[in-house]
């Protein structure tokens, strides 16, 4: 039994496919050395409330992506959203759950911003 999810393929998308001379969409197989982990990723922008996917595909061995079964961006309001995950096609869906900075508790609890899903 595998101790972790092995990423063998990811959803591929490139909004700039013509300029970058790539396919626009498809499935990307993630090959690699036996001692390296592979991940899936998604990057997107939030343009006035509308989600615009920038890129999706395989991502190189990155400790920040280890053991993440879901693709979730946790940074608060980045200009470009990014998430990575492990497991086949785990970047098909992605979401945004900003981590609230720990400050002195207030009487009014902070409601997390709603996630975005593809």
């Amino acid at each position: 039994i595998l101790g972790r999810s092995e990423t063998q393929e990811c959803l591929f998308f490139n909004a700039n496919w013509e300029k970058d001379r790539t396919n626009q969409t498809g499935v990307e197989p993630c090959y690699g050395d036996k001692d390296k982990r592979r991940h899936c990723f998604a990057t997107w922008k939030n343009i006035s409330g509308s989600i615009e996917i920038v890129k999706q595909g395989c991502w190189l061995d990155d400790i920040n992506c280890y053991d993440r079964t879901d693709c979730v961006e946790k940074k608060d309001s980045p200009e470009v959203y990014f998430c990575c995950c492990e497991g086949n096609m785990c970047n098909e869906k992605f979401s945004y759950f900003p981590e609230m900075e720990v400050t002195q508790p207030t009487s009014n609890p902070v409601t997390p911003k709603p996630p975005y899903y593809n």
């Epitope: 970058d20 592979r38 395989c58 991502w59 190189l60 920040n64 980045p78």
Partner: antibody, heavy 120, light 107 residues
Framework: QVQLVQSGAEVKKPGASVKVSCKAS????????MHWVRQAPGQGLEWMGW????????NYAQKFQGRVTMTRDTSISTAYMELSRLRSDDTAVYYC?????????????WGQGTTVTVSS | DIQMTQSPSSVSASVGDRVTITCRAS??????LAWYQQKPGKAPKLLIY???SLQSGVPSRFSGSGSGTDFTLTISSLQPEDFATYYC?????????FGGGTKVEIK
């Protein structure tokens, strides 16, 4: 081991062309894009463009459009960069660099560099 | 085009010092950032990719951090072989662009 070996130094006159080669070994040549980067004396690194050896597709920096041609010969695992209408400010060390197969595509293996001198 | 601005352009330090180099992108590039080391007369060498991932074979005294527009390369304890020029580079959108470089010199 993975290696990129470039052709030797060149001296050219203004207006001429130069063609630099980059021979790959130790990996599947068609599995990685090949980029070209140059460095003028005492200056920083300047990205010129890339070729996908599998498809032959290229992507050039605007600055070099119309003057640069990147090609490859998959039978001998070699990439080429030709720069035409040379000027004195093209004097530089030219590097080929393999990029990783996947995002975020770092340049993980570099050639040793080819010095091109443009002088009348 | 995305501009990459490195600072400082040069830094004088001693063996054992902690050295920090910063790189700022003119627009968000998420984590599409790499750091390279170049010694005189040699080709650049990849140190860090994806803003913070250490390339195989690179000593752990090198570390990278940041995302979006602001990035940092840190050498925790400078060694004699670390005196070199360091470049950041973005691969988020074409054309790929490099920072102007930071020369780490012996004090």
């Amino acid at each position: 081991q993975v290696q990129l070996v470039q052709s030797g130094a060149e001296v050219k006159k203004p207006g001429a062309s130069v063609k630099v080669s980059c021979k790959a070994s130790g990996y599947t040549f068609t599995g990685h894009k090949m980029h070209w980067v140059r460095q003028a004396p005492g200056q920083g690194l300047e990205w010129m463009g890339w070729i996908n050896p599998a498809s032959g597709w290229t992507n050039y920096a605007q600055k070099f459009q119309g003057r640069v041609t990147m090609t490859r010969d998959t039978s001998i695992s070699t990439a080429y960069m030709e720069l035409s209408r040379l000027r004195s400010d093209d004097t530089a060390v030219y590097y080929c660099a393999r990029v990783s197969m996947y995002a975020p595509e770092p340049m993980d293996v570099w050639g040793q560099g080819t010095t091109v001198t443009v002088s009348s | 085009d995305i501009q990459m601005t490195q600072s400082p352009s040069s830094v004088s330090a001693s063996v054992g010092d902690r050295v920090t180099i910063t790189c700022r992108a003119s627009q968000g590039i998420s984590r599409w950032l790499a750091w390279y080391q170049q010694k005189p007369g040699k080709a650049p060498k990849l140190l860090i990719y994806a803003a913070s991932s250490l390339q195989s074979g690179v000593p752990s005294r090198f570390s990278g951090s940041g995302s979006g527009t602001d990035f940092t390369l840190t050498i925790s304890s400078l060694q004699p072989e670390d005196f070199a020029t360091y470049y950041c580079q973005q691969a988020f959108s074409h054309p790929w662009t490099f920072g102007g470089g930071t020369k780490v010199e012996i004090k």
